[in-house]
Amino acid sequence: ASHSGMINPSRQWQTLKQNTGVAHFEYQIRVTCDDYYYGFGCNKFCRPRDDFFGHYACDQNGNKTCMEGWMGPECNRAICRQGCSPKHGSCKLPGDCRCQYGWQGLYCD
């Protein structure tokens, strides 16, 4: 027995039924992507990392989900302390607020 057609990657088993006239076949099949690959064509890659290149996990669709305190397309931009002046403060670590020269205070304001 042979089956022709698209089977999308999924964790679920699919039941396929086939009647050849001589015999009736019923079988279960599933297609899974290799580790860290996602999507219908398994053509999306996501592997969690927490380093210079980014701080993220991966959701079930292979999208990067930034760890708490990080943002940006690659999750490598820290979210500063709430209230930190966008003009006179900045941060390289989440929750931080480093003041420009000549400015001070908890929020560099």
Epitope: D34, D35, Y36, Y37, G72, P73, E74, N76, R77, K92
Partner: antibody
């Protein structure tokens, strides 16, 4: 469209420094890191380092660590690579490139010739 | 540093041939591997990233496979425009390094 435009060819004497620029357009400059790669005549590709364009933090190939400096000017969306104490072996085409999962966008290359 | 061993260093083939280039790394890099094509006087062009994902606009005759330490770039049916030099590169850890290149020539 995304473009990375590099500065022109340079002729330098041994011991001098060179600063190559890479001006980007077509996307938010601080969203993606910039890498620098070089290629000596008839040779392969050599990764020099990466700069986080948002913070200006760099990571260098140890081979160049004491001689290379990568910087950015966010106001002009330009990345710079400066290589000091030049020697003849530094004669190469220097490329800037954008990306994390491979370099989809490259500058046109800058030929740096080191000769006395 | 992670060493990249690319083979063969040069290869002669004919239009229509199936060609395979391999890249072996000195340690596990998962799927952090990229393949490039370079023609004389031009910047490299991205072909495949994350070991097996075809870059936008790249013909389907190119394919990548492998994970861990062993990787392959395959061209299923060589076209005249495919004669060039091919490089693999890892982007797992610093420094990112390139293979030595494979020069693909017309037989």
């Amino acid at each position: 469209q995304v473009q990375l435009v590099q500065s022109g060819a340079e002729l330098k004497k041994p011991g001098a420094s060179v600063k190559v620029s890479c001006k980007v357009s077509g996307y938010a400059f601080t969203d993606y890191a910039i890498h620098w790669i070089r290629q000596a005549p008839g040779q392969g590709l050599e990764w020099m380092g990466i700069i986080n364009t948002y913070y200006g933090d760099s990571k260098y190939n140890q081979k160049f660590k004491d001689r290379v400096t990568m910087t950015v000017d966010k106001s002009t969306s330009t990345a710079y690579m400066e290589l000091s104490s030049l020697r003849s072996e530094d004669t190469a085409v220097y490329y800037c490139a954008r990306g994390y999962d491979g370099f989809a966008y490259w500058g046109q290359g800058t030929l740096v010739t080191v000769s006395s | 540093d992670i060493q990249m061993t690319q083979s063969p260093s040069s290869l002669s083939a004919s239009v229509g041939d199936r060609v395979t280039i391999t890249c072996r790394t000195s340690e596990n890099i998962y799927s952090y591997l990229t393949w490039y094509q370079q023609k004389p006087g031009k910047a490299p062009k991205l072909l495949v990233y994350n070991a097996k994902i075809l870059a936008a606009g790249v013909p389907s005759r190119f394919s990548g496979s492998g994970s861990g330490t062993d990787f392959t770039l395959t061209i299923s049916s060589l076209q005249p425009e495919d004669f060039a030099t091919y490089y693999c590169q890892h982007h797992y850890d610093i420094p990112w390094t390139f293979g030595g290149g494979t020069k693909l020539e017309i037989k």
